[in-house]
Structure formats: C-alpha cells, structure tokens
C-alpha cells in the first residue's frame, strides 16, 4: 500500500504574543521533488484554508507575503509557525501534504493540532 501518513502534535499552546509553532512530518511513499503544504482550520463543520506553500525539495518553504504562516523544511519534515493568533482563533489546525511532482500524486492529511490561544491580560494601570 503506497499511502502517505502525516503526523503532527495533538496540542500546542500559542505564546502570549499569539504565535504557535508545530512540526508536520510526512512519510513519503515516493521521491517527490515538489511538495505542497496547506494548513486548514476546522471549526464545527466549516473548513478554511489558513495558508499554503509549494516548495521544491531542498529549497525553503515560501508562503505569500501577506500570509500569517512562515515555515522551514528539512527532508520530510516541515516546521510551521502561525502568527497573529487571538483567542477566537483557538481551534483544530490540520496539516495537509500533497506530493505534486513527479507522478504519481499523493495526498496526506494529519489528524490536526488543537491550538489554544489565550489573549494576554491588559496591564493594570499603575498608581506610581
């Protein structure tokens, strides 16, 4: 069976600055030279694309300039960082990996990483 398994952590807590990082690792059944990584957010039954990047193996992962994601790749592992998160963005973030070239195409979808985001408390006014 030539299936592609994708692994990602079950839970990640975003930093107080609204930044969350996690690793998306895939077991490639072939020798892909072009890979597409997409981060999906599932909330209830709604699925939205958070960001996506296509990269050539051995090269850096490049998201669009206005993307809230950044990342680096190393072999079959992608280190993803999502920034600008707020409490309302808490949810399940799913890593989708596609081996685009050469044929055959393969799809792999992770089980998702539950990212918890806690908005920082505003600093209390000082009496001093």
């Amino acid at each position: 069976c030539k299936a592609m398994h994708v692994a990602q952590p079950a839970v990640v807590l975003a930093s107080s600055r609204g930044i969350a990082s996690f690793v998306c690792e895939y077991a490639s059944p072939g020798k892909a030279t072009e890979v597409r990584v997409t981060v999906l957010r599932q909330a209830d039954s709604q699925v939205t694309e958070v960001c996506a990047a296509t990269y050539m193996m051995g090269n850096e992962l490049t998201f669009l300039d206005d993307s809230i994601c950044t990342g680096t790749s190393s072999g079959n592992q992608v280190n993803l960082t999502i920034q600008g998160l707020r409490a309302m963005d808490t949810g399940l973030y799913i890593c989708k990996v596609e081996l685009m070239y050469p044929p055959p195409y393969y799809l792999g979808i992770g089980n998702g990483t539950q990212i918890y985001v806690i908005d920082p408390e505003p600093c209390p006014d000082s009496d001093f």
């Epitope: 296509t54 989708k96 195409y105 799809l107």
Partner: antibody, heavy 118, light 106 residues
C-alpha cells in the same frame, strides 16, 4: 454561492476536436485542484484529468493517450478541457468537479454532453 | 491503479428499510469517498475520509471501514434516497470510482 457551470458540449464527428469550459464562481479558484470526470450513457463515473492550483502540474487518465489537455485560466476563473482526435467511445456527459479541502470532489457542475458520431 | 468493486450491483428495498452498500479495494486505500447520483443529475458528495459526512448530508447516511473494506449505510431509506451510489478513492493518482450500486424501490 459556490458554483461550477460547464459549456461547450455538442455533436462532433470522429477525429475532430472540441473544447469544454467550466466557469467557477463563489470560491478562490486558485486554491483548489480542478478535475474533469466523464460518464458514458448508462455507465459509471470515469476520472479524466486534474490541474492543480497554479496550473503547472496536470495529471491524466492513462486511457486518454495524450489526446486530451486540461488547463485553467485563473484570471477568468475558468477550467478547460481540449479534446482532440475524438472517438465514438468519448461520447459521455463531462463534469467538472472541485477537489475539496480534504481531497474528495465536493462541488460538481451540471455536466455537458459530448456526442461523437458520424 | 486501485480497482474498487462495489456490491451488490442492485439493492431492492422499501422506504424505511436499512441499506448496506459495500466497496472493496484491490489494495489498501487511505482516503475513500461516497457519492450519490440521481438520474439526469450530477453526483453529490456524501462521505469523505471513509466516515465523515459532507456538509448538509443527513445523519441517516454513515460510512465506515478502513484498508480494503468500506461500507455505506443508510439507516432508514427515504423516498429521495433511491439512486445510484459510487465509492471513490482519492489518496493518490489515478483517481478511481467503483462501478456503482443502484438502490431501487422494491
């Protein structure tokens, strides 16, 4: 709303060419793989081709032997299927379908009928 | 190429009855979908990932299975459920469909 509308079908003689179009609306066209699937009269579904995202990578069913070409125009939100050297066995309803976020074909057009006959 | 074999070819049932449709793959598949098609209409996605219901699909439709054996169950057939059902694998190219199971009124 999210919609796919095919056009370009009709009756054509064997050996001739035809180009099908699929107009997409209601979603970001470049964020999805787009497929063509066909269905011969009274038969099942047969996958034909896919074009990915920016349109560079394309895959075809082996049975088509290079006669069909899939393409997309992102500026027009339109998917195409150029069919050359048509044969009787290409007679079918041709559907365009969106490869959804999780990979399955979540949105389908209404289909366009192609009849190859002399 | 992964070959999907559906059984039975035709299922004759009455409204209110339970329908069980089978799809067997020639090799293990990771991603399997089910579609419903009514005469003169395009297919409609019912189930993806073997068991997840697509948006707007009633909960009387359920999918199960893994590896090479998959099942679509319609718990209580409604008049609008009489149609042809196709399974499909979509985890790698080429994408393939089963030959279909027709659910008809007995």
């Amino acid at each position: 709303q999210v919609q796919l509308v095919e056009s370009g079908g009709g009756v054509v003689q064997p050996g001739r060419s035809l180009r099908l179009s699929c107009a997409a609306s209601g979603f970001t066209f470049s964020s999805y793989g787009m497929h063509w699937v066909r269905q011969a009269p009274g038969k099942g579904l047969e996958w034909v081709a896919v074009t990915w995202y920016d349109g560079r990578n394309k895959y075809y069913a082996d049975s088509l032997k290079g006669r069909f070409t899939i393409s997309r125009d992102i500026s027009k939100n339109t998917l195409y299927l150029q069919m050359n050297s048509l044969r009787d066995e290409d007679t079918a309803v041709y559907y365009c379908a969106r490869g959804g976020s999780y990979g399955a074909f979540d949105i389908w057009g209404q289909g366009t009928m192609v009849t190859v006959s002399s | 190429e992964i070959v999907l074999t559906q059984s039975p070819g035709t299922l004759s049932l009455s409204p209110g009855e339970r329908a069980t449709l089978s799809c067997r793959a020639s090799q293990s598949v990771s991603y399997l979908a089910w579609y419903q098609q009514k005469p003169g209409q395009a297919p409609r996605l019912l189930i993806y990932g073997a068991s997840s219901r697509a948006t707007g699909i009633p909960d009387r439709f359920s999918g199960s299975g893994s590896g090479t054996d998959f099942t679509l169950t319609i718990s209580r057939l409604e008049p609008e459920d009489f149609a042809v059902y196709y399974c499909q694998h979509y985890g790698s190219s080429p994408w393939t469909f089963g030959q279909g199971t027709k659910v008809e009124i007995k």
